[in-house]
């Protein structure tokens, strides 16, 4: 099976690596920019130079490349609670992150905001906080968890998955709640 | 085919609450988090909340904290926002919105039809 290339790619992949084809004149491959700068004007013939500039501020391109303009610098979120761990730079974009125990949630695959790791109060810890995961924990007897948080089985209701974990409890309370009965 | 209706919208005085509703169908609803959009007249589309699947993880607009309230039924495949407090800036069309799952440059994949919120005296 041949897969299936965009135009770009069929284009470029007439020249050897490294270079692009013209796109005014297709005998001529001209050589790709290098990470950090962006093409100004293609090589004006075979075996000349390609007019590559620099990134100016706020933009970069962090590959070999033949576009026309820089990319954007990203910008980390702050009301997403992101910190930037690295600053944009002409070949390298913006590295954003979270503090010290925390945590990245992904809303989507480029999209993710930060929480604070569970401290398993009333528990042990199972699993360490990752940089893409929570704590686990581990609920000491008489708690149970709760969005990674171990609660006490006085707050399980009946009708909640913590019954099979608390049952000892809710069977007391119902025993005190019976024999109180008259 | 995948369906995201909301209901729950209307004209209500300052101070007042809402809770909006979005009945979710044609795809697992489990397997998603999922937004409230909302666009105020004139006004570009700004990011309400998000929930997580499992509903776990939420995130509110500056905006909204303390007031609105995301939430789930898994169970019913429903979303839901509880409005409190509104403020006139609350008057928008609220759209309820499923996250893609896939680098692509929007960030929701799918959008019910919206619901008009009017907060007016």
């Known amino acids: 099976l041949v897969p299936h290339l965009g135009d770009r790619e069929k284009r470029d992949s007439v020249c050897p690596q490294g270079k692009y084809i013209h796109p005014q004149n297709n005998s001529i491959c001209c050589t790709k920019c290098h990470k950090g700068t962006y093409l100004y004007n293609d090589c004006p013939g075979p075996g000349q130079d390609t007019d590559c500039r620099e990134c100016e501020s706020g933009s970069f391109t962090a590959s070999e490349n033949h576009l026309r303009h820089c990319l954007s610098c990203s910008k980390c979120r702050k009301e997403m609670g992101q910190v930037e761990i690295s600053s944009c730079t002409v070949d390298r974009d913006t590295v954003c992150g979270c503090r010290k125990n925390q945590y990245r949630h992904y809303w989507s695959e480029n999209l993710f905001q930060c929480f604070n790791c569970s401290l398993c109060l009333n528990g042990t810890v199972h699993l360490s906080c990752q940089e893409k995961q929570n704590t686990v924990c581990t609920c000491h007897a008489g708690f149970f968890l709760r969005e990674n948080e171990c609660v006490s089985c006085s707050n399980c209701k009946k009708s909640l998955e913590c019954t099979k974990l608390c049952l000892p409890q809710i069977e007391n309370v119902k025993g005190t709640e019976d024999s109180g009965t008259t | 085919e995948v369906q995201l209706l909301e209901s729950g919208g209307g004209l209500v005085q300052p101070g007042g609450s809402l809770r909006l509703s979005c009945a979710a169908s044609g795809f697992t609803f489990t397997d998603y988090n999922m937004a409230w959009v909302r666009q105020a007249p004139g006004k570009g589309l700004e990011w309400v909340s998000f929930i997580s699947q499992e509903g776990h993880h939420t995130y509110y607009a500056d905006s909204v904290k303390g007031r609105f309230t995301i939430s789930r039924d898994n169970s019913k495949n429903t979303l839901y926002l509880q409005m409190n407090s509104l403020r006139a800036e609350d008057t928008a069309v609220y759209y309820c919105?499923?996250?893609?799952?896939?680098?692509?440059?929007?960030?929701?994949?799918?959008w019910g039809q919206g619901t008009l919120v009017t907060v007016s005296s």
């Open positions: 919105a499923k996250f893609s799952t896939i680098a692509t440059l929007s960030l929701f994949d799918y």
